[in-house]
Interface confidence: low
């Protein structure tokens, strides 16, 4: 057969738990070059289901800072600027991947972790339970 | 600042690009055990700014399948169930981390990548530009 040098090859993993342990290059490639990150920055104030952003910080996690949305009201803001409790402000949640240092304090060893974060809020019609 | 000692049990990195290249355990720890994943599953229909979910698939990426929200209307649904164009349905976007296989075909080598995804939609008051 044809011998192809190992130039384009894959890094070896010495880890016995392989394939669970992989090499990850943290030099992040950002595919959002054409997007304006500020374009949704004021939605939290202008929404009929406005929210506040809370800083969730954890030095053992990457990214270490995550912003969590908390809906300001149980109801939604109506055309008069008042809270309408016939509607509900609810958080839109998403599962995201983060890296957690494992063992703790190790600069070059992480575990992949799924966490649920609230990204913003939306206004929904409530589910009404009728009592017989 | 406080110096965090380097845990003596940390794996060494032979990689010349260290600390850019780290070891990651892919045996995912899910911290969402107490959450009900279905609890926001119908918000996309019940919202005053409803959205559809589109499957974004990429076999070079982990996770391979990401669901993208697309707002159904430019306006928002009013109390009569009609679209009110005095308000705007807008996507709530979030930057998330994904892993991209690099080099291709390598089962144990990835690069961290940031992508912008639309998680859901919210109803906002439009910004009105007054012409002098």
């Amino acid at each position: 057969g044809i011998t192809i040098p190992r130039n384009p090859g894959c890094p070896n993993s010495e880890d016995k738990n392989f394939p669970r342990t992989v090499m990850v290059n943290l030099n992040i490639h950002n595919r959002n070059t054409n997007t304006n990150p500020k374009r949704s920055s004021d939605y939290y104030n202008r929404s009929t289901s406005p929210w506040n952003l809370h800083r969730n910080e954890d030095p053992e996690r990457y990214p270490s800072v995550i912003w969590e949305a908390k809906c300001r009201h149980l109801g939604c803001i109506n055309a008069d600027g008042n809270v309408d409790y016939h509607m509900n402000s609810v958080p839109i949640q998403q599962e995201i991947l983060v890296l957690r240092r494992e063992p703790p304090h190790c600069p070059n060893s992480f575990r992949l972790e799924k966490i649920l974060v609230s990204v913003g809020c939306t206004c929904v019609t409530p589910i009404v339970h009728h009592v017989a | 600042g406080i110096t965090i000692p380097r845990n003596p049990g940390c794996p060494n990195s032979e990689d010349k690009n260290f600390p850019r290249t780290v070891m990651v355990n892919l045996n995912i720890h899910n911290r969402n055990t107490n959450t009900n994943p279905k609890r926001s599953s119908d918000y996309y229909n019940r919202s005053t700014s409803p959205w559809n979910l589109h499957r974004n698939e990429d076999p070079e990426r982990y996770p391979s399948v990401i669901w993208e929200a697309k707002c159904r209307h430019l306006g928002c649904i009013n109390a009569d169930g009609n679209v009110d164009y005095h308000m705007n349905s807008v996507p709530i976007q979030q930057e998330i981390l994904v892993l991209r296989r690099e080099p291709p075909h390598c089962p144990n080598s990835f690069r961290l990548e940031k992508i912008l995804v639309s998680v859901g939609c919210t109803c906002v008051t439009p910004i009105v530009h007054h012409v002098a």
């Epitope: - | 070079e60 996770p63 075909h105 390598c106």
Partner: antibody, heavy 124, light 107 residues
Framework: EVQLLESGGGLVQPGGSLRLSCAAS????????MNWVRQAPGKGLEWVSY????????MYADSVKGRFTISRDNSKNTLYLQMNSLRAEDTAVYYC?????????????????WGQGTLVTVSS | DIQMTQSPSSVSASVGDRVTITCRAS??????VAWFQQRPGTAPRSLIY???NLQRGVPSRFSGSGSGTDFSLTITGLQPEDFATYFC?????????FGGGTRVDIN
Amino acid sequence: EVQLLESGGGLVQPGGSLRLSCAASGFTFSFYNMNWVRQAPGKGLEWVSYISSSGGLTMYADSVKGRFTISRDNSKNTLYLQMNSLRAEDTAVYYCARDSPDYGALGGTYFDYWGQGTLVTVSS
Amino acid sequence: DIQMTQSPSSVSASVGDRVTITCRASQDIRNYVAWFQQRPGTAPRSLIYGTSNLQRGVPSRFSGSGSGTDFSLTITGLQPEDFATYFCHQYSSNPLTFGGGTRVDIN
């Protein structure tokens, strides 16, 4: 049903050129990495070239590097292999092969679907 | 690159027999092994991936095992349509490589 159909093979003289095509159907072509694999008469299989789903990344076996070019047209659901400076040792059946998806498991990607192949004969 | 040494190069068997084909990798490839079946004049067909996972639609008489450097494909209860050539394939590292093939003939 996933289908891959190669075309463009034939008899060519040493030093000549050929362009192979692979028409894909039954799946979303633009989602998948694709490959060319060849099989010399009565011999084993040899990976030739790879192209990523977007077409932005390509790889070649050393035996064809500089002579072969892989490309794709996602709007036409078609994979191509431009073969220049052909040699007698390039004589083989050429298959296009799809990389498997890798849902969740991060278990690596193998060739999950293959075409029927097209025969390339390099001879004077 | 990683060499995949497949044995035997051919085997004669009868319908109903149990046939085992082995593949040895030149270095540790963990479980990144796939097996293909190729009937004369047709395209290779994926049977097994990840050493032991059956591709959708493949009969359960096919099974795979092994880890590290030694792998095997077993056909339990050979059927007429199983007479073909079988290839192992490593996808642990570029360049992706294949075994030389094992031809399963009718006895």
